[in-house]
Amino acid sequence: MMTGTIETTGNISAEKGGSIILQCHLSSTTAQVTQVNWEQQDQLLAICNADLGWHISPSFKDRVAPGPGLGLTLQSLTVNDTGEYFCIYHTYPDGTYTGRIFLEVLESSVAEHGARFQIP
């Protein structure tokens, strides 16, 4: 029975050239988190494994930094970074929990954070 919920940073915006932290938090479950995947569409950005720690995909090494915590920091943002990002929590025994974040990278200097929201 999957009882957990994922809270994410929701819809967020950031300035071109800047950086942003993507954060997810799994709650309401006693399931063991074995790995967290960070993905953009179907591209794997990074993995945080309970045994191995962090692995950043080679193609993103220059612009992605692990943390804080199980979050992910995107640096040197471009307009092409606009889009959906997913945190996928692999847990036992529950299985897979997915959180969604939409990032908009703005040309202007007006970049405000959206509200937090939950995905069951």
């Epitope: 063991q32 074995t34 995947n37 794997l44 993995i47 494994n49 309970a50 045994d51 692995h55 299985g95």
Partner: antibody, heavy 119, light 107 residues
């Protein structure tokens, strides 16, 4: 080339024990979670157990919990499945398989080792 | 446990044809379904994962689709080496479970 070679299967009486091994080569064994999957004589596939890359976490299907123990020796590039209190329904071909780094399915399998539980 | 119903269990086709194999889950498994090929004397091969992502090295004539409870494996322009046993497997929650298999034979 990734290779997984199982061994240790055989004929055993009900209530008996057996230890299967799976020797890995061609990849950094310590970086991957590993699984045991079995195939019944009727060709049904069943996931049996899984172990994390460092061996810290182990998971089992309900029917083998308390009877089977999955373990690994990363220095020897070897995965193990220790089976006790064997039952006739444990008769199957046992495969070791490597879990994808992103955890989405099993990308390499061994050729299997046969276990027969019969009196 | 998530039950996976795979159909058909047997399929006969000719080289060059296009075939589909279906898997239905007893509850939603999001996109997390994998497809495997089993051939005598060879090790099982991962074809598709996460419903539609082609495993590295697998020919593009193999494709997967679906999400939620209903999934399909399509093999277009069948090659002689494609005649084999095919299994689907959900990798959404433990215990991971498999479909009963589809035997694809030459007509």
């Amino acid at each position: 080339e990734v290779q997984l070679v199982e061994s240790g299967g055989g004929l055993v009486k009900p209530g008996g024990s057996l230890k299967l091994s799976c020797t890995a080569s061609g990849f950094t064994f310590s970086s991957y979670a590993m699984s045991w999957v079995r195939q019944s004589p009727e060709k049904r596939l069943e996931w049996v157990a899984e172990i994390s890359s460092g061996g810290s976490y182990t998971y089992y299907t309900d029917t083998v919990t308390g009877r089977f123990t999955i373990s690994r020796d990363n220095a020897k590039n070897t995965l193990y499945l220790e089976m006790s209190s064997l039952r006739s329904e444990d008769t199957a071909m046992y495969y070791c398989a490597r879990k994808r780094r992103d955890y989405y399915g099993m990308d390499y399998w061994g050729q299997g080792t046969s276990v027969t539980v019969s009196s | 446990d998530v039950q996976i119903t795979q159909s058909p269990s047997y399929l006969a086709a000719s080289p060059g044809e296009t075939i589909t194999i279906n898997c239905r889950a007893s509850k939603s498994i999001s996109k997390y379904l994998a497809w495997y090929q089993e051939k005598p004397g060879k090790t099982n091969k991962l074809l598709i994962y996460s419903g539609s992502t082609l495993q590295t090295g697998i020919p593009s004539r193999f494709s997967g689709s679906g999400s939620g409870t209903d999934f399909t494996l399509t093999i277009s322009s069948l090659e002689p080496e494609d005649f084999a046993m095919y299994y689907c497997q959900q990798h959404n929650e433990y215990p991971w479970t498999f479909g009963g298999g589809t035997k694809l034979e030459i007509k």
